[in-house]
Interface confidence: low
């Protein structure tokens, strides 16, 4: 008489996570009588997946009715597959007994699970950096399978090359994670720039996942300061202007000092944005020349984004005989810019 054959026709089956997996198994004979059981793995540590004779296995259903007379198809369908279900599945024929006796195993079907990577999460540096400095961005994506994956970095559409990427774990696993670091050299024009981490995987059907980070979160553009004197007004007041230009972010405090004493402090707010994303701010200080006997040293002091203050000074020269208030004659004064 022919020996009983347990036939598992597929050596491997690949299924997308969330889908159902059908594992096929047929036997060549109804003799001897006895149940079929499905296991994941072999040996003493194997895991019972389905017992067509008894038990309750909510995610597993037989493809054909196992109680039907003359049934020789013991295929199963496992629903809602996750990466944890990957492994080699064996269809095993038992001979009826007390207990049932293992008779023959199929060759096994390896189930691999195609799991989509999670949406890439891009994180930037903890502190801002200025132009010409290099900052690092990190991109992470998890839970994908198989291991093969492609990750690319772009800055404003141009691919970055200073990149280091790792896929973990190195060995076999039910799912994998990728971590990549890109080094980006900042320029003053990068306030509106964006870095994109693009992940391509077989499960994404050619439509890669993207994570983004705005360089505006990573960059600090320090301001330029210029202090100038406008022509003297008829009332012997001099208008001194401090122009703070091309800075980012907006967080800025400006303090006027007259001869080293604080005259006024202002905070920047609701400034219009330049085309390049930076901001400009102009502050004025009126100096009554008549009230001073000596030259006045004006200092525009700017604290930007928590950085050490930057100063720009300007001396208003007061003539030996200042005119009375309201006189139409200009005071004899000259301005000198000092750092």
């Amino acid at each position: 008489e022919e020996e009983l054959q347990v036939i598992q026709p597929e050596k491997s089956v690949s299924v997308a996570a969330g889908d159902s997996a059908t594992l096929n198994c047929t036997v060549s004979s109804l003799i001897p009588v006895g149940p079929i059981q499905w296991f994941r793995g072999a040996g003493p540590g194997r895991e019972l997946i389905y017992n067509l004779k008894e038990g309750h296995f909510p995610r597993v259903t037989p493809v054909s009715d196992p109680t039907k007379r003359n049934n020789m198809d013991f295929s199963i369908r496992i629903s809602n597959i996750t990466p944890a279900d990957a492994g080699t599945y064996y269809c095993v024929k038992f001979r009826k007994g007390s207990p049932d006796v293992e008779l023959k195993s199929g060759a096994g079907t390896e189930l691999s699970v195609r799991a989509k990577p999670s949406a890439p999460v891009v994180s930037g540096p903890a502190v801002r950096a200025t132009a010409e400095h290099t900052v690092s961005f990190t991109c992470e994506s998890h839970g994908f399978s198989p291991r093969d994956i492609t990750l690319k970095w772009f800055k404003n559409g141009n691919e970055l090359s200073d990149v280091q990427t790792n896929v973990d774990p190195a060995g076999k696993s039910v799912s994998y994670s990728i971590r990549s670091t890109a080094r980006v050299v900042l320029t003053r024009r990068d306030v509106h720039s964006q870095v994109i981490c693009e992940v391509a995987h077989v499960t994404l059907q050619g439509d890669p996942l993207r994570g983004t980070a705005n360089l505006s979160e990573a960059i600090r553009v320090p301001p330029f300061l210029e202090v100038t004197q406008q022509s003297m007004r008829a009332d012997n007041q001099v208008n001194v202007t401090c122009q703070v230009t091309k800075f980012y972010p907006q967080r800025l405090q400006l303090t006027w000092l007259e001869n080293g004493n604080v005259s006024r402090t202002e905070m920047a707010s609701a400034l219009p944005e330049n085309k390049d994303g930076t901001y400009n701010w102009t502050s004025w200080l009126l100096v009554n020349v008549s009230a001073h006997r000596d030259d006045v040293k004006l200092t525009c002091q700017v604290e930007h984004d928590g950085q050490p203050a930057v100063n720009k000074s300007f001396s208003v020269k007061v003539s030996a005989h200042p005119k009375e208030q309201g006189s139409n004659t200009a005071a004899e004064n000259t301005g000198t810019n000092e750092r």
């Epitope: 059908t22 909510p58 259903t61 009715d65 629903s79």
Partner: antibody
């Protein structure tokens, strides 16, 4: 993920009629398609399921009266020899019961068997 | 073959009230839990509410709940709304794959 029936019409008794269920958004290799009907003024009645692989099964009352087949995106239900008792709205639905319940359902297609 | 007996055939409830419909199987359903509940409104396809006896389908309001095991099953609607007016069917599955049987239905009228 959707299913939609087509092919319902007025036929004379004994004239075979094939209904088609067109699916989108999921794979017929991973899900069975079940057929259910509702005669006018009556309740729902399970007909059968076209499952994965070559597995097709019908309720005991429906065996011999219906056959099923499928392609990659469609499932056909053939009423082999309709009688007036087969007048009903026929629904197809994804699923094969138990932990793969019938969901979603198509809008239904009306079959009228009359001489 | 499996027979599903559903009671009552019709029930009336006020908005905000509670409705229960029961299904009795002639024998234990497959795995003791092969029981689903469907809502059916005229001119529309049936809609899955509950499967595996007590698992709420995606997108179904939590006022619907299912319970039971083996041969006795119950669908409960707590805090009935006017939109719940419909016929509710249980679907039981026997040990044979093809042995899927609907109950006769319960018409819910909302006052």
């Amino acid at each position: 993920r959707s299913v939609e029936e087509s092919g319902g019409r007025l036929v004379t008794p004994g004239t075979p009629l094939t209904l088609t269920c067109t699916v989108s958004g999921f794979s017929l290799s991973s899900h069975g398609i079940s057929w259910v009907r509702q005669a006018p003024g009556k309740g729902l009645e399970y007909i059968g399921t076209i499952g994965t692989g070559v597995i097709t099964y019908f309720a005991s009352w429906a065996k011999g009266r219906f056959t099923g087949s499928k392609t990659s995106t469609t499932v056909d239900l053939k009423i082999t020899s309709p009688t007036t008792e087969d007048t009903a709205t026929y629904f197809c639905a994804r699923g094969s019961a138990w932990n793969d319940p019938f969901d979603p359902w198509g809008p239904g297609t009306l079959v009228t068997v009359s001489s | 073959a499996l027979v599903m007996t559903q009671t009552p055939a019709s029930v009336s409830a006020a908005v905000g009230g509670t409705v229960t419909t029961k299904c009795q199987a002639s024998q234990s359903v497959y795995g003791n839990n092969d029981l689903a509940w469907y809502q059916h409104k005229p001119g529309q396809p049936p809609k899955l509410l509950i499967y595996l006896a007590s698992t709420l389908a995606t997108g179904v309001p939590s006022r619907f709940s299912g319970s039971g095991s083996g041969t006795q099953f119950t669908l409960t609607i707590t805090g009935v709304q006017s939109d719940d007016a419909a016929t509710y069917y249980c679907l039981g599955g026997g040990d044979d794959e093809a042995d899927n049987v609907f109950g006769g239905g319960t018409e819910v009228v909302v006052k």
